[in-house]
């Protein structure tokens, strides 16, 4: 039970996630005009991945978009990248993790494929939410540099009577909003591992004797000190010895000629 | 046609307030940004404070700020400027105008003004 | 606040001739994020209102003959009016539409020679 719900707590997380990622990339707001020196403006300026836009006081919003891919910063074109990366990675993800929700059956699909399957989105989660916080930091980073920039060329050159202040720009929402969904793709990312080692089989390390009814030989059947991955052979999820002790997973077994030595 | 009529304008000692009115007809008041502009008698054109279309945001000239409010109705299409403490260099031709929607900030559309004459 | 400049305060110019009319702001009204000059200029005639005739520094306005030009960038801005009319004769004003307060300038007076 506990599994099956940190499992979906997992899912939901990355969900919601990987939307604020998709969100924060088409934001416009990556960056805002600082209004520091000029609260008062009558046009202001904001920039995303995609475009640049102008709001102007009389409520007409202008925005052109970066029509060159060459003439464009590395930076934004490696922002961009990580970005799309992490939104490929996470839709990959929940793709993934919906089949491999315990809450849903298909088909026979054994416990040790779910399992294998919530690694893997947990996996794609985790690298999703690195890409998109890797992606708002080097932003913001870009951003930190070119205020303090900007500020120092604003403070130089002012000799004359006439003064041409340079726009200055701020962390926008688009920021926070990518900060938030990559954490939460990330802690999604945690959950649906940690909810694996719960849906693995596990195999315990003590002998055990199975006795079968319908034949004669008895078949001894040592643990052994396996290395215990989640991903041993045992597909049917059944412990060798239960202890009388049933879970609703387990179905009645037919003996197959790997059960005997 | 875009209209725009100014009214309430008056003689008034310095202390005292005064309501002006602006009535719009002939466009969408409520998508545009109005502005109240004052002229002196010495012919000088002054912006005395900016409303935005949904009300939400409202400049003023330091000189007014905390003295006049401006406001507007967009059910009645109407936009207010009101007065209060007035002194003598308040004394101009008050005008109502909008802010055109592509024109850059700038002043698409002017009413006739009224006249406000602040004297003891 | 931005102080507007104008030049020269009154100019008479003969029909048909260029008349030019200039205007200094103390900050630059030219926007980066869209490369626009935040600039408009008005004309008034006695007993009206004033009159939009140009606006982001060169666009002429709806209805506004074309012998009414903008040009400038920045800080420096001209008015020209390339071929003077009897119904030009008014006091033309800029304004900065870039920051608060929209300031005027204090206007020049335009008459025939």
């Known amino acids: 039970m506990a599994v099956t719900a940190c499992q979906g707590l997992g899912f939901v997380v990355s969900l919601i996630g990987i939307a604020g990622i998709i969100a924060a990339t088409c934001m416009d707001q990556w960056s805002t005009q600082d209004l520091y020196n000029n609260p008062v403006t009558a046009v202001f300026n904001y920039q995303g991945l995609w475009r640049s836009c102008v709001r102007e006081s009389s409520g007409f919003t202008e925005c052109r978009g970066y029509f060159t891919l060459l003439g464009l910063p590395a930076m934004l074109q490696a922002v961009r990248a990580l970005m799309i990366v992490g939104i490929v990675l996470g839709a990959i993800g929940l793709l993934v993790s919906i089949f491999a929700l315990k809450c849903i059956r298909i088909g026979s699909m054994e416990d040790s494929a779910k399992a294998n399957m919530t690694l893997t989105s947990g996996i794609m989660f985790i690298v999703s939410g690195l890409c998109a916080i890797a992606g708002v930091s080097v932003f913001a980073n870009m951003l930190v540099t070119n205020f303090w920039m900007s500020t120092a060329n604003m403070y130089t050159g002012m000799g004359g009577m006439v003064q041409t202040v340079q726009t200055r720009y701020t962390f926008g929402a688009a920021l926070f909003v990518g900060w938030v969904a990559g954490g939460l793709t990330l802690i999604g990312g945690v959950m649906m591992c940690i909810a694996c080692r719960g849906l693995a089989p596990e195999e315990t390390n003590y002998k055990a004797v199975s006795y079968h009814a319908s034949g004669h030989s008895v078949a001894y059947k040592p643990g052994g000190f396996k290395a215990s991955t989640g991903f041993g052979s045992n597909t049917k999820n059944k412990k060798i010895y239960d202890g009388g002790a049933r879970t609703e997973d387990e179905v009645q077994s037919y003996p197959s000629k790997h059960d005997y030595v | 046609e875009v209209m725009l009529v100014e009214s309430g304008g008056g003689v008034v000692q310095p202390g005292g307030s005064l309501r002006l009115s602006c009535a719009a007809s002939?466009?969408?008041?409520?998508?545009?940004?109005m502005s109240w502009v004052r002229q002196t008698p010495e012919k000088r054109l002054e912006w005395v404070a900016t409303i935005v279309g949904g009300g939400g945001y409202t400049y003023y000239l330091d000189s007014v700020k905390g003295r006049f409010t401006i406001s507007r109705d967009n059910a009645k299409n109407t936009l207010y400027l009101q007065m209060n403490s007035l002194r003598t260099e308040d004394t101009a031709l008050y005008y109502c105008a909008r802010m055109g929607l592509t024109q850059r900030n700038a002043l698409d559309y002017w009413g006739q003004g009224t006249l406000i004459t602040v004297s003891s | 606040d931005i102080v507007m400049t104008q030049s020269p305060d009154s100019l008479a110019v003969s029909l048909g001739e260029r008349a030019t009319i200039n205007c200094k702001s103390s900050q630059s009204l030219f926007n980066s994020g869209n490369q626009k000059n935040y600039l408009a200029w008005y004309q008034q005639k006695p007993g009206q209102p004033p009159k939009l005739l140009i606006y982001?520094?060169?666009t002429r306005e709806s209805g506004v003959p074309d012998r009414f030009s903008g040009s400038g960038f920045g800080t420096d801005f001209t008015l020209t009016i390339s071929s003077l009319q009897a119904e030009d004769v008014a006091v033309y004003y800029c304004?900065?539409?870039?920051?608060?307060?929209?300031?005027f300038g204090a206007g020049t007076k335009l008459e025939i020679k």
């Open positions: 982001g520094a060169s």
């Open positions: 304004q900065n539409d870039h920051t608060y307060p929209l300031t």
């Open positions: 002939g466009f969408t008041f409520s998508t545009y940004t």
